[in-house]
């Protein structure tokens, strides 16, 4: 009888993570008597995957009827494949003895595992930044195999080009990770903007995974201030308003100063929202001019989102007949809210 040969017909097998892998092996003879064993890897450090003779291998089942001697098919199925199962598997015939001795090995079957990348996680800077500044976003995805992967960045559907991507490790591994950093220039209109990281991989069948970051968590739009004097409401009373426009986020505190002395402090609450996501807010100050002998310098001071205060002043002439006066704008942006504040004397 011809000497036994161990035939592993498949040089390689590719399986998706979570599925079962079938590794084929047949022998050409019933002799010598002795067990078949499957190993992952070769040499002294090889890992026993299945032993026909003994042992408990919960993930391994024999594909064909193993209770018949004439069966020469020693194919196995390994369930619930993970990237850690990747490697070359050898079907080995042993000759019965003490100890059993290796008689002949198959040529090996390389098992590669297709593993999906994890959902991309996009993270932005730790601190908010203002328009015209460049900020960095990172995107990470892990656990995929094979190594080939494509990553793209978008801002509101427009592809970005200023980014750097690394796939680790560089050498062979059971699975890989991707890390990318993109640079984005902020504009005042970015409150509603999104940055998207898109990952395409063979396991995703043309349906890429996306991770997003809202620029609303990154941007700070400073308010612009405008202080104006309204027509006289009553004899000796002047209404001064401070318009706080186009600011974001909403966190804002306003203080009225009369000749440098704090008159009133309030926090923006009932704001109005602009289409671009920024906020507007208005504060009134009712000034009793008869209580003042000299001109009054009214200052609207705004502290936005923990930043240094910005202010806008208005000179109120007490000698002249009250009439509407204008004022310039200053600093930042974001918000909307109308609320009456009655301050001053009398």
């Amino acid at each position: 009888e011809e000497e036994l040969q161990v035939i592993q017909p498949d040089k390689s097998v590719s399986v998706a993570a979570g599925e079962s892998a079938i590794l084929h092996c047949t022998v050409t003879s019933l002799i010598p008597v002795g067990p078949i064993q499957w190993f992952r890897g070769a040499g002294p450090a090889r890992e026993l995957i299945y032993n026909q003779k003994e042992g408990h291998f919960p993930r391994v089942t024999t594909v064909s009827e193993s209770t018949k001697r004439e069966n020469m098919d020693f194919s196995i199925s390994i369930s619930n494949i993970t990237p850690a199962d990747a490697g070359t598997y050898y079907c080995v015939k042993f000759r019965k003895g003490s100890p059993d001795t290796e008689f002949k090995s198959g040529a090996g079957t390389e098992l590669s595992v297709r593993a999906k990348p994890s959902a991309p996680v996009v993270s932005g800077p730790a601190a908010r930044a203002t328009p015209q500044h460049t900020v960095s976003f990172t995107c990470e995805s892990h656990g995929f195999s094979p190594r080939d992967i494509t990553l793209k960045w978008f801002k509101n559907g427009n592809e970005l080009s200023d980014f750097q991507t690394n796939v680790d490790p560089v050498g062979e591994s059971v699975s890989y990770s991707i890390h990318s950093t993109a640079k984005v220039v902020l504009t005042r209109e970015d409150v509603h903007s999104q940055v998207i990281c898109e990952v395409a991989h063979v396991t995703l069948q043309g349906d890429p995974l996306r991770g997003t970051a809202n620029l609303s968590e990154t941007i700070r739009v400073p308010p612009t201030l405008e202080v104006t004097q309204q027509p006289v409401r009553a004899e000796n009373q002047v209404n001064v308003t401070c318009q706080v426009r186009k600011f974001y986020p909403q966190r804002l505190q306003l203080t009225w100063l009369e000749n440098g002395n704090v008159s009133r402090t309030e926090t923006a609450s009932t704001v109005t929202e602009n289409k671009d996501g920024t906020y507007n807010w208005m504060s009134w100050l009712l000034v009793n001019v008869s209580a003042h002998r000299d001109d009054v310098k009214l200052t609207c001071q705004v502290e936005h989102d923990g930043q240094p205060a910005v202010s806008k002043s208005h000179d109120l002439k007490v000698s002249a007949h009250p009439k509407e006066q204008g004022s310039n704008t200053a600093a930042e942006n974001t918000g909307s809210n109308e609320r009456n504040i009655y301050g001053g004397s009398g």
Partner: antibody, heavy 118, light 107 residues
Amino acid sequence: EVQLVESGGGLVQPGGSLRLSCAASGFTLSSYDMHWVRQAPGKGLEWVSAIGTAGDTYYTGSVKGRFTISRENAKNSLYLQMNSLRAEDTAVYYCVRGGVWDDAFDIWGQGTMVTVSS
Amino acid sequence: DIQMTQSPSSLSASVGDRVTITCRASQDINNYLAWFQQKPGKAPKSLIYTASSLHSGVPSKFSGSGSGTDFTLTISSLQPEDFATYYCQQYVSYPYTFGQGTKLEIK
């Protein structure tokens, strides 16, 4: 059903010959190593002979040169030709199938009695 | 030839008892050891192969262990039908050899 049925036992004089048969059913005999085991009255079990799937044969020392094991695939049968029989060959002879991959005995026949006496 | 020595040669026990029979090989036989049960006038029945694997249909009250030269057969809770003679056998190399047997009797 997997089954082994022995036949051919009987009374024979010392120096005589006997041919034991074992008919297999439920499996292909040629795919398995097959064995003969005997048990003298009131004694333990003794392995006698085996034939491998390639036709290779094995014997215990006391029967070597006197007994011949063979099989006939067409009849799915195993045989033991016993010549120059001695009184100490008196025993129940069992036909036994070797296991799937390690030749561990798994199926036994009911046995046939061989008595060597003058 | 490899010699197989069983002990004890006979053993008295009661229904419900747990009993252990030992078998020693004169040289290393890996785990190519089988256990058989035989009742008077009947053919032996295969219980265990490769020292610890149960043949199909054999109840789990039978268990085997060991490797190399020392082996044991344990019956966890004796029932009336378990009183019989038990044999060990090495089948690592020809000639295959049996132990002399252990007769398990009702006390």
